[in-house]
Interface confidence: medium
């Protein structure tokens, strides 16, 4: 049969951050190519990354259509043949279905990782500092505009702020379910800040990595008496 020499894909892995979503798998192809299919639980299969020699497929355009849907994906291993007319169907020249491997179910809203946040600015007024976290743009669209992380997650998303005096290592924390913190600081002291995005309602992928550290006395800050 035409598929006897193909190797089924394995180690299928979803890599997704802020809804940018790529399906990866092994092995590197030898005498075969891959085609990926994706569907919702109730929908039809849609083919992507036709006859690719890559071992990854960007499925972002599909999953952002509804990030609260559950998606199924599978990778077909297709024999590499040069046919006389230069075209192949997914099911080979003899109509048999090539071997495929299913990926685990993927629910973008639950499974996408939170990207590393960025501190947009901080402003000191007397003994208070307002720290603002940048609202990261996602690839989820609404009316042809890209939505931010807050647009998509709303109250599900909180931020944790870690802050400490430049002169010491003792960290304090604050939390917000907006993108802003207002914290008390000691006058005349410089502070450093780092933030982390958190979705408390999740059981996995709850936290992002910490943002780069920003310290008072650097460009991002502003000081007013």
């Amino acid at each position: 049969s035409g598929t006897t020499n193909t190797v089924a894909a394995y180690n299928l892995t979803w890599k997704s951050t802020n809804f940018k979503t790529i399906l990866e798998w092994e092995p590197k192809p030898v005498n075969q190519v891959y085609t990926v299919q994706i569907s919702t639980k109730s929908g039809d299969w849609k083919s992507k990354c036709f006859y690719t020699t890559d071992t990854e497929c960007d499925l972002t355009d599909e999953i952002v259509k509804d990030v609260k849907q559950t998606y199924l994906a599978r990778v077909f291993s297709v024999p590499w043949r040069n046919s006389t007319h230069g075209k192949e169907t997914l099911f080979g020249t003899h109509g048999e279905e090539p071997p495929f491997t299913n990926a685990r179910k993927f629910l973008p809203y639950r499974d996408t990782k939170l990207g590393q946040p960025t501190i947009q600015s901080f402003e000191q007024v007397g003994t208070k500092v307002n720290v603002t976290v940048e609202d990261e743009r996602t690839l989820v669209r609404r009316n042809n505009t890209f939505l931010s992380l807050r647009d998509v997650f709303g109250k599900d998303l909180i931020y944790t702020l870690y802050y400490w005096k430049s002169s010491s290592s003792g960290k304090k924390t604050a939390k917000t379910n907006t993108n802003e913190f207002l914290i008390d600081v000691d006058k005349g002291e410089n502070y450093c800040f780092s933030v982390q995005a958190v979705i408390p309602s999740r059981t996995v992928n709850r936290k992002s990595t910490d943002s780069p550290v920003e310290c008072m006395g650097q460009e991002k800050g502003e000081f007013r008496e």
Partner: antibody
């Protein structure tokens, strides 16, 4: 079509326990918050708390924390609001609602309400 | 908690005339991250469950007639009905959808003169 169907009216005595339900259909139940809202006779709307059925994560209004319990069974697409010991002041219409698709975009779908009457 | 204050509490209107309801919040509902105001408007018609009209202060929910519009930013918001119809009677509520606990205004009762 998205629908939230609530259990029927209840008449209870003070001190009794009660659980009312809200069954969702026409959408994937797990990733949408279910909100509970109280409306006392002739009064306005009061937000009580919410639950994300996929994980059972809840948030309560401080005004209701400790007096009610919100839970959900995602396998049957149903959320619950329960009291262990009712008071006369719990007499009200209770609505469940589903959050909108986008973050913090309001309560897009509402149940028909469950009237709870607590009287000795 | 964020306190939501609506005015007026009662609004008699002649059909075909415009109507305006004000809602003020005790804290800003503007997210500096994405410049969205998390203010929501609902209408509860007599004997019915509330229905969503406007979210993000100015985004009309699908199916809501375009005679309804929302505006405002920060702490001051307005719901306008360009031409009131008989079916618009009921109680209008604004809601803080920005931060927990979510809070409603006390309601504005619109009635036909």
């Amino acid at each position: 079509e998205v629908q939230l169907v609530q259990s029927g009216a209840e008449v209870k005595k003070p001190g009794e326990s009660l659980r009312i339900s809200c069954k969702g259909s026409g959408y994937t139940f797990a990733p949408y918050w279910i909100e509970w809202v109280r409306q006392m006779p002739g009064k306005g709307l009061e937000w009580m708390g919410d639950i994300l059925p996929g994980t059972g994560f809840t948030t309560y209004s401080p005004s209701f924390q400790g007096h009610v319990t919100i839970s959900a069974d995602k396998s049957i697409s149903t959320a619950y609001l329960q009291w262990s010991s009712l008071k006369a002041s719990d007499t009200a219409m209770y609505y469940c609602a589903r959050s909108g698709y986008y973050g913090n975009s309001g309560f897009a779908y509402w149940g028909q309400g469950t009237l709870v009457t607590v009287s000795s | 908690d964020i306190v939501m204050t609506q005015t007026p509490l009662s609004l008699p209107v002649t059909p075909g005339e415009p109507a305006s309801i004000s809602c003020k919040s005790s804290q800003s509902l503007l997210s500096s991250g994405n410049q969205k105001n998390y203010l929501t408007w609902y209408l509860q018609k007599p004997g019915q469950s509330p229905q969503l009209l406007i979210y993000w202060a100015s985004t009309r929910e699908s199916g809501v007639p375009d005679r309804f519009s929302g505006s405002g930013s920060g702490t001051d918001f307005t719901l306008k009905i360009s031409r009131v119809e008989a079916e618009d009677v009921g109680v209008y509520y604004c809601q803080n959808d920005y931060t927990y606990p979510l809070t409603f205004g006390q309601g504005t009762k619109l009635e036909i003169k």
